[in-house]
């Protein structure tokens, strides 16, 4: 699987999850998030050669098409597969609120 | 929605579904498919600016991050959202077989 365990160890050039630390205030301008100050959101990148973690029949077909017609530039793209939530603390007035934001952390990627 | 109806009419530069006709024999080397000879598989391409048909909270965050940090090159990617099956006819010996291949035709795209 193209997950953090594999990708962060092997530094694959093809489609894989990459580490990306986001500071809420500095990188997004979100001053309202009190904790955490930032988190590893990660992201997916890298080429999707034929059959690499193909998501659907279409991505398999498109990968083959691109292999046989490389000038066509129509190839699958490396995108998130498994995502995890992130719990944040913020304030409404002086009242602390804890909320779980869904799909905030990329754990693995696929070619779609 | 970034679907064929909208995208094929408007020729959007940002993330949209693009027409792609695939001839099974010529483009894939699949001589075993008897009918159809080819089909519109389509594909997704185009930039994913902040908030364009964002798939998850992560793609929204990544889109904002990329807007504020354009040199970072970590941005969402335009990939299939809705796919449809394709019915094909092939032969096993002299016996005709009809099969529905799932997820063969891209009908719409999203930024993931």
């Amino acid at each position: 699987a193209l997950d953090t365990n594999y990708c962060f160890r092997n530094l694959e050039e093809n489609c894989c999850v990459r580490p990306l630390y986001i500071d809420f205030r500095q990188d997004l301008g979100w001053k309202w998030v009190h904790e955490p100050k930032g988190y590893y959101a990660n992201f997916c990148s890298g080429p999707c050669p034929y059959l690499r973690s193909a998501d659907t029949t279409h991505s398999t077909v498109l990968g083959l098409y691109n292999t046989l017609n490389p000038e066509a530039s129509a190839s699958p793209c490396c995108v998130p597969q498994d995502l995890e939530p992130l719990t944040i603390l913020y304030y409404v007035g002086r009242t602390p609120k804890v909320e779980q934001l869904s799909n905030m952390v990329v754990k693995s990627c696929k070619c779609s | 929605a970034l679907d064929t109806n909208y995208c094929f009419r408007n020729l959007e530069e940002n993330c949209c579904v693009r027409p792609l006709y695939i001839d099974f024999r010529q483009d894939l080397g699949w001589k075993w498919v008897h009918e159809p000879k080819g089909y519109y598989a389509n594909f997704c391409s185009g930039p994913c600016p902040y908030l364009r048909s964002a798939d998850t909270t992560h793609s929204t965050v990544l889109g904002l991050y990329n807007t504020l940090n354009p040199e970072a090159s970590a941005s969402p990617c335009c990939v299939p959202q809705d796919l449809e099956p394709l019915t094909i006819l092939y032969y096993v010996g002299r016996t005709p077989k009809v099969e529905q291949l799932s997820n063969m035709v891209v009908k719409s795209c999203k930024c993931s």
């Epitope: 017609n69 000038e71 | 094929f8 009419r9 408007n10 027409p19 006709y21 010529q26 483009d27």
Partner: nanobody, 119 residues
Framework: QLQLVESGGGLVQPGGSLTLSCAAS????????MSWVRQAPGKGLEWVSV????????HYSDSVKGRFAISRDNAKNTLYLQMNSLKPEDTAVYYC????????????RGQGTQVTVSS
Amino acid sequence: QLQLVESGGGLVQPGGSLTLSCAASGFTFSLYPMSWVRQAPGKGLEWVSVIGSDGGTKHYSDSVKGRFAISRDNAKNTLYLQMNSLKPEDTAVYYCAEGDSRYVRGRTRGQGTQVTVSS
């Protein structure tokens, strides 16, 4: 089976005009964008123009903008390219292509039509 048949090419003097046609069959023509591409002698395929499925949206390469006009007749399953103020550098084999050739350079399906601009 998808088929595209181009016609209307010929020999024309610089500054002259031609109208190319492309008859399409084997698919629902009215649903898809269509393009014109060309191949000059010894060169690769060059995108010329694209038109949206309903004919409302059109784009042109910088080299032909203001001189060429793309159009379509969905009732007749036909694509057109009106070429005005022709230049010697427009000499090429012209192909129509299913889809938007700005994004995908697939193989040419038709036989093309030769346009030669010369005095």
